[in-house]
């Protein structure tokens, strides 16, 4: 036997569903298709943002390693030599995310050697 409190919750949820879908079959079908499309588009958008932020983080990681004056950390146990501070500077000109101290670091670090 379902407790009355739980039954009331179920009824509220069912009423909400009926109200939102206006319970006429046609609009339920239409709505579900557009909702599926909306969810699909949202999924695509989230995936796009994930891609954008993935690369931003990757770029920022390189910048941070250098700005902190740390050698770029070995990614695995492979043959990675210690790196000089100026070996692979990533210069960021996204000004709003750089404090003055960071900017000074970048200026010092970007005595970029020509390849």
């Amino acid at each position: 036997m379902i407790p009355a409190k739980d039954m009331a919750k179920v009824m509220i949820v069912m009423l909400a569903i009926c109200f939102l879908t206006k319970s006429d079959g046609k609009s339920v079908k239409k709505r579900s298709v557009s909702e599926i499309q909306l969810m699909h588009n949202l999924g695509k958008h989230l995936n796009s943002m994930e891609r954008v932020e993935w690369l931003r983080k990757k770029l920022q990681d390189v910048h941070n390693f250098v700005a902190l004056g740390a050698p770029l950390a070995p990614r695995d146990a492979g043959s990675q030599r210690p790196r000089k501070k100026e070996d692979n500077v990533l210069v960021e000109s996204h000004e709003k995310s750089l404090g003055e101290a960071d900017k000074a670091d970048v200026n010092v670090l970007t005595k970029a050697k020509s390849q």
């Epitope: 958008h45 070995p74 990614r75 960021e92 996204h94």
Partner: antibody, heavy 120, light 111 residues
Framework: EVQLVQSGAEVKKPGESLKISCKGS????????IGWVRQMPGKGLEWMGI????????RYSPSFQGQVTISADMSISTAYLQWSSLKASDTAMYYC?????????????WGQGTLVTVSS | DIVMTQTPLSLSVTPGQPASISCKSS???????????LYWYLQKPGQPPQLLIY???NRFSGVPDRFSGSGSGTDFTLKISRVEAEDVGVYYC????????FGQGTKVEIK
């Protein structure tokens, strides 16, 4: 199919300024980073820098920092590469390239290239 | 910078014969996420580069199965099982574990 269409070839004199463009179409321009790659005559490919058009976050290769400026106008889905004072050594083919759709760490679509010739 | 070194720099191949290009990186390209950020591009004459292989061994969409990539860490190989006339051009390896750098290119021509 994704398209990156670059502006036409340019012939300039040393000391002149230049801005070349790369217009993206058939995809959402603000969902991908756009990189610029240089190819000097008869030489290999060099990555110059990259921009995210959504907020103009821009990163440069150390070799090109201070030499060029990368920008974007998301309202017209266009990225730019510009020089304030060209040198003869800037003579090269310049490509724009889009961050991969599912190969996130690489470039999967490229513009046709813009040939820049700097000569007195 | 991570330096990418390709060998040979040029290759002349008889149609139908195999070809192999080597690429060595100055540092391991294996990332902490388990992926190895090594790619192969082909630049045909008068065209922009086109992606062939991503993450060492995965063929990009539309790339014929005669192209294959292998390797790990710092040593990588691109193989063409049977070279065709349309395969001529310059092949580049590229790393993206740390910014982007390309190998100097290997020019493939038909005998």
């Amino acid at each position: 199919e994704v398209q990156l269409v670059q502006s036409g070839a340019e012939v300039k004199k040393p000391g002149e300024s230049l801005k070349i463009s790369c217009k993206g179409s058939r995809y959402i321009f603000t969902n991908y980073w756009i990189g610029w790659v240089r190819q000097m005559p008869g030489k290999g490919l060099e990555w110059m820098g990259i921009i995210y058009p959504g907020d103009s976050d821009t990163r440069y290769s150390p070799s090109f920092q201070g030499q060029v400026t990368i920008s974007a106008d998301m309202s017209i889905s266009t990225a730019y590469l510009q020089w304030s004072s060209l040198k003869a050594s800037d003579t090269a083919m310049y490509y724009c390239a889009r961050q991969g759709d599912y190969v996130w760490g690489s470039f999967d679509s490229w513009g046709q290239g813009t040939l820049v010739t700097v000569s007195s | 910078d991570i330096v990418m070194t390709q060998t040979p720099l040029s290759l002349s191949v008889t149609p139908g014969q195999p070809a192999s290009i080597s690429c060595k990186s100055s540092q391991s390209l294996l990332d902490s996420d388990g992926k190895t950020y090594l790619y192969w591009y082909l630049q045909k004459p008068g065209q922009p580069p086109q992606l062939l292989i991503y993450e060492v061994s995965n063929r990009f969409s539309g790339v014929p199965d005669r192209f294959s990539g292998s390797g790990s860490g710092t040593d990588f190989t691109l193989k063409i099982s049977r070279v065709e006339a349309e395969d001529v051009g310059v092949y580049y390896c590229m790393q993206s574990i740390q910014l982007w750098t390309f190998g100097q290119g290997t020019k493939v021509e038909i005998k």
